[in-house]
């Protein structure tokens, strides 16, 4: 779970060790603040749960790519 310290800065201290199916993901945001110990991705699932993930992992990068393409593709 992401942890907000002195909001609005949100940091991730641990990453999920489970690969999440892209079908369960709704969006993501990048954590890049130097107030955080590490850069991270926070995925928001379709049930609005937020999960910290390691941006160095291939499945995380692939999921971000998928979501970015999906976001830009107009829904018909």
């Amino acid at each position: 779970q992401p942890d907000a310290i002195n909001a609005p800065v949100t940091c991730c201290y641990n990453f999920t060790n489970r690969k999440i199916s892209v079908q369960r993901l709704a969006s993501y945001r990048r954590i890049t603040s130097s107030k955080c110990p590490k850069e991270a991705v926070i995925f928001k699932t379709i049930v609005a749960k937020e999960i910290c993930a390691d941006p160095k992992q291939k499945w995380v990068q692939d999921s971000m790519d998928h979501l970015d393409k999906q976001t830009q593709t107009p829904k018909t």
Epitope: R30, T32, S34, P37, K38, E39, P55, K56, D65, D68, K69, T71, Q72
Partner: antibody, heavy 117, light 107 residues
Framework: QVQLVQSGAEVKKPGSSVKVSCKAS????????MHWVRQAPGQGLEWMGR????????KFDPKFQGRVTITADTSTSTAYMELSSLRSEDTAVYYC??????????WGQGTTVTVSS | DIQMTQSPSSLSASVGDRVTITCKAF??????RAWYQQKPGKAPKLLIH???SLEHGVPSRFSGSGSGTDYTLTISSLQPEDFATYYC?????????FGGGTKVEIK
């Protein structure tokens, strides 16, 4: 406070090599990627490559492949960039930068490398 | 490589002016672009990354927009400290590439 401090200016002969260092403080380099970007006098920015200090995996612009070596020492939080077979066109300011996503939040102060006979 | 074409290469403006810089990618980069400001003799400074993420400490007069291949940096009311060179960069795929830069000068 994240800081990237680079080694000093270098003057090199054509055909030789140069090695530039970049010491990080305020972050654990194994958590990020360390990149190298150069800028020739009066010119734009050019990405050269990056290293994942955690596993030493590297990625380069094909333009520099075979001529550039990027290494990192996590024990000293230092990244290095070595460029070989120097030519006059390599005269530039060389910057290290950090960022796991491919954009660069923090930059070193730059190291001027002059290649001249 | 994804080529980034930035325009104009230079512009003259006055304090208080609204300034727009454009960047065109040669293929879709899905909002994965960043904007940097660089002053003479200094390292570039990250202003914006991704769709709308303004870096911490960057004034709100800076904004980014666009999608697909076309992106814009807008400075809503130019301040004296904004005279500098601005670069766009794509981070959709390596090798990461920069636009040629836009020098914003005092009119």
């Amino acid at each position: 406070q994240v800081q990237l401090v680079q080694s000093g200016a270098e003057v090199k002969k054509p055909g030789s090599s140069v090695k530039v260092s970049c010491k990080a403080s305020g972050l654990t380099i194994s958590h990020t990627y360390m990149h190298w970007v150069r800028q020739a006098p009066g010119q734009g920015l050019e990405w050269m490559g990056r290293i994942d200090p955690d596993n030493h995996n590297t990625k380069f612009d094909p333009k520099f492949q075979g001529r550039v070596t990027i290494t990192a020492d996590t024990s000293t939080s230092t990244a290095y960039m070595e460029l070989s077979s120097l030519r006059s066109e390599d005269t530039a300011v060389y910057y290290c930068a950090r960022g796991v996503f491919g954009f660069f939040e923090h930059w070193g102060q730059g190291t001027t490398v002059t290649v001249s006979s | 490589d994804i080529q980034m074409t930035q325009s104009p290469s230079s512009l003259s403006a006055s304090v208080g002016d609204r300034v727009t810089i454009t960047c065109k990618a040669f293929e879709d980069i899905y909002n994965r672009r960043a904007w940097y400001q660089q002053k003479p003799g200094k390292a570039p400074k990250l202003l914006i990354h991704g769709a709308t993420s303004l870096e911490h400490g960057v004034p709100s007069r800076f904004s980014g927009s666009g999608s697909g291949t076309d992106y814009t940096l807008t400075i809503s009311s130019l301040q004296p400290e904004d005279f500098a060179t601005y670069y766009c960069q794509q981070f959709w795929s390596a090798p990461y590439t920069f636009g040629g830069g836009t020098k914003v000068e005092i009119k």
